[in-house]
Amino acid sequence: EPPTACREKQYLINSQCCSLCQPGQKLVSDCTEFTETECLPCSESEFLDTWNRETRCHQHKYCDPNLGLQVQQKGTSETDTICTCEEGLHCTSESCESCVPHRSCLPGFGVKQIATGVSDTICEPCPVGFFSNVSSAFEKCRPWTSCETKDLVVQQAGTNKTDVVCGPQDRQRA
């Protein structure tokens, strides 16, 4: 009797279990009682990444330089093109359809994690003993200068945005 379910990598059509097309190929014609499924390779700018019965291959993603995108990995007949962002930019979503500039950490904040093509800069507040006096996408919080090691004394306390100011020690008169 005609099957009601088919094996893996097959599909049911007109009471026939037909082989699916392998990744990188599209369906031309379903199998019949007397013939196999017929498949054709996707063209150079197209792909199909699963066992399928698609009659059209998908177009490779276009990495649009006007949106700050560049090719990270060229697509094949079985895989889509992977885009990433140009230097100084990162993706706005997981699918990386557009890019935005990396965020800079404001004074008082330092870079905890430098941005990549797919993730933004992560900033952190400078803790006590550290400062950042610049807006930067690269600079970490820097430690306050140690006046003691220079045989100096603190003349002005540091903040999260400024370094300490060191000065000479007051000389004791006999």
Epitope: S19, V28, S29, D30, T32, E33, F34, T35, E36
Partner: antibody, heavy 112, light 112 residues
């Protein structure tokens, strides 16, 4: 339901060309399947002659050498057989078939 | 070509009794995908062949379940579990794995 119907002359002279047409109803010959011509000489078995595919490409039995041509007219949903340089050995019942469905067959006699 | 040899060439069976027909190919009919395109047909007297079994063991729509097909590679069998009067005619196997497609020479089934 799919139906096939052969038509053409029942008598052909030796050395002439045998021409038959198969009219298909209930299914488009461009959708899928291979559309075959098969013959059966009197009192003998079945012989596959060739087919035309849904996409218009062909395959022929090498035993018929360069004598056979199968073509189609998609506007009429028909496919046709031409067999040249016929002899008495080509006398047979000629069937057009999708294999799951067959025409009723037409008798062709080769005689002067 | 794949030469198809059927045995026996004739068969006389009492109604209600089983019948078995063998078809042997000169080469394997299993293709590179593991599918085998071996079919069985019945040609009743004065009629066109009708499909009984396709791809070795699949009954075509409307074919009674007393007909079954089995086999693999080069050896295939058609079984009728209980022969009925309407089963008379010539049974053919046909392979469509390899071009040219080739038929067995036929087995004539008669009723005792």
């Amino acid at each position: 339901e799919v139906q096939l119907q052969e038509s053409g002359p029942g008598l052909v002279k030796p050395s002439e060309t045998l021409s038959l047409t198969c009219t298909v109803s209930g299914y488009s010959i461009t959708s899928n399947y291979y559309w075959n011509w098969i013959r059966q000489p009197p009192g003998k078995g079945l012989e596959w002659m060739g087919y035309i595919r849904y996409d218009g490409s062909n395959n022929y039995n090498p035993s018929l050498k360069n004598r056979i041509t199968i073509s189609r007219d998609t506007s009429k949903n028909q496919f046709s057989l031409k067999l040249s340089s016929v002899t008495a050995a080509d006398t047979a019942v000629y069937y057009c078939a999708r294999l799951d469905y067959w025409g009723q067959g037409t008798t062709v006699t080769v005689s002067s | 070509d794949a030469v198809m040899t059927q045995t026996p060439l004739s068969l006389s069976v009492t109604p209600g009794q089983p019948a078995s027909i063998s078809c042997r190919s000169s080469q394997s009919l299993e293709n590179t995908n593991g599918n085998t395109f071996l079919n069985w047909f019945l040609q009743k007297p004065g009629q066109s062949p009708q499909l009984l079994i396709y791809r070795v063991s699949n009954r075509f729509s409307g074919v009674p379940d007393r007909f079954s097909g089995s086999g693999s590679g080069t050896d295939f069998t058609l079984k009728i579990s209980r022969v009925e009067a309407e089963d008379v005619g010539v049974y053919f196997c046909l392979q469509v794995t390899h071009v040219p497609f080739t038929f067995g020479q036929g087995t004539k089934l008669e009723i005792k």
